[in-house]
């Protein structure tokens, strides 16, 4: 398993919808063919994966239907959203990429964008 | 750590075939990466020759396509270079080199002297 | 093929100061460039990849920048050992290709 360097931002802000959008840049060694994104998210020392995508290089990022990230790549870059977040979604959001083909395998993990949710306040009642 | 060492003969006749050698230590060339011949004229810049890969495949600079076959030994883990019909220009250090695919060079050879003389 | 030109063919640069060399591709590379060192008589090491990320072992004063088809290696201050031969390389397209060289001496 070989090293690879993985940047992300370290704070991003969600929008009041819940959606949060960050760039995961890669320092690739060279052109993979197939590269593997993950997301994992870790709050209270507990890491749990958010989603994941593979995706032939050239194609777009396809996650899984019911998958609450998407995400388009160009490059050694991907950039990822996150939707349907609330404050309780609130931590440390972390990237890892994986080159998967062609060989050797390579794996970088980023040191996690901090994502902070806050729920929107309730619209007050109005007289009108 | 890997480590790659050129060696063949360092005078070749015009017309004749230049046949250089690559050994490589610390790394099995089966397990993947691709691997190059790159070359260097007195005074003058890098060009590259072409790869073999880990799979056995292969490419080759078109301006040298034609003149170019490289091949790989697993058992002996080395690959060469056969470059036919050479003239003087074809005179030039050969360094051979590892990469990932369409990636940079990260580990190279000390090179290897080829002098194309009568 | 893509042609990389570097500039200035001849950098003459005093111990201490900030270089600055140049590479043009003659067309859209990405960030899918390194950067060479060579000295008289050996191989070329690498220095920079992926356009900005130093390979493992290189001093901080390296550092490299650019996208598309502009890019820059930058040593911020002359170390007697960095006086030697630059160059830059793209691994966006096949062939794989190299520019010229910038030659970094001593003024």
């Known amino acids: 398993c070989k090293a690879m360097h993985v940047a992300q931002p370290a704070v991003v802000l969600a929008s009041s919808r819940g959606i949060a959008s960050f760039v995961c840049e890669y320092a690739s060694p060279g052109k993979a063919t197939e590269v593997r994104v993950t997301v994992l998210r870790q709050a209270d020392s507990q890491v749990t994966e958010v989603c994941a995508a593979t995706y032939m290089m050239g194609n777009e990022l396809t996650f899984l239907d019911d998958s609450i990230c998407t995400g388009t790549s160009s490059g050694n870059q991907v950039n990822l959203t996150i939707q349907g977040l609330r404050a309780m979604d609130t931590g440390l959001y972390i990237c890892k990429v994986e080159l998967m083909y062609p060989p050797p395998y390579y794996l970088g993990i980023g040191n996690g964008t901090q994502i902070y949710v806050i729920d929107p306040e309730p619209c007050p009642d109005s007289d009108f | 750590q890997v480590q790659l060492q050129e060696s063949g003969p360092g005078l070749v006749k015009p017309s004749q075939t230049l046949s250089l050698t690559c050994a490589v230590s610390?790394?099995?060339?089966?397990?993947?990466?691709?691997w190059n011949w790159i070359r260097q004229p007195p005074g003058k810049g890098l060009e590259w020759i072409g790869y073999?890969?880990?799979?056995?495949?292969?490419y080759y600079n078109p301006s040298l396509k034609s003149r170019v076959t490289m091949s790989v030994d697993t058992s002996k883990n080395q690959f060469s270079l056969k470059l036919s019909s050479v003239t003087a220009v074809d005179t030039a250090v050969y360094y051979c080199?590892?990469?990932?695919?369409?990636?940079?060079?990260?580990?190279w050879g000390q090179g290897t002297t080829v002098t194309v003389s009568s | 093929e893509i042609v990389m030109t570097q500039s200035p063919a001849t950098l003459s640069v005093s111990p201490g100061e900030r270089a600055t060399l140049s590479c043009r591709a003659s067309?859209?590379?990405?960030?899918?460039v390194a950067w060479y060192q060579q000295k008289p008589g050996q191989a070329p090491r690498p220095l920079i990849y992926s356009t900005s990320y130093r390979y493992s072992g290189i001093p901080a004063r390296f550092s490299g920048s650019g996208s598309g088809t502009e890019f820059t290696l930058t040593i911020s201050s002359l170390q007697s050992e960095d006086f030697a031969v630059y160059y830059c390389h793209q691994y966006d397209t096949y062939p794989l290709t190299f520019g010229q060289g910038t030659k970094l001496e001593i003024k």
């Open positions: 610390g790394y099995s060339i089966s397990s993947g990466y691709y």
């Open positions: 067309q859209n590379v990405g960030t899918y």
């Open positions: 080199a590892r990469n990932y695919y369409s990636g940079y060079f990260d580990s």
């Open positions: 073999i890969g880990y799979d056995g495949s292969n």
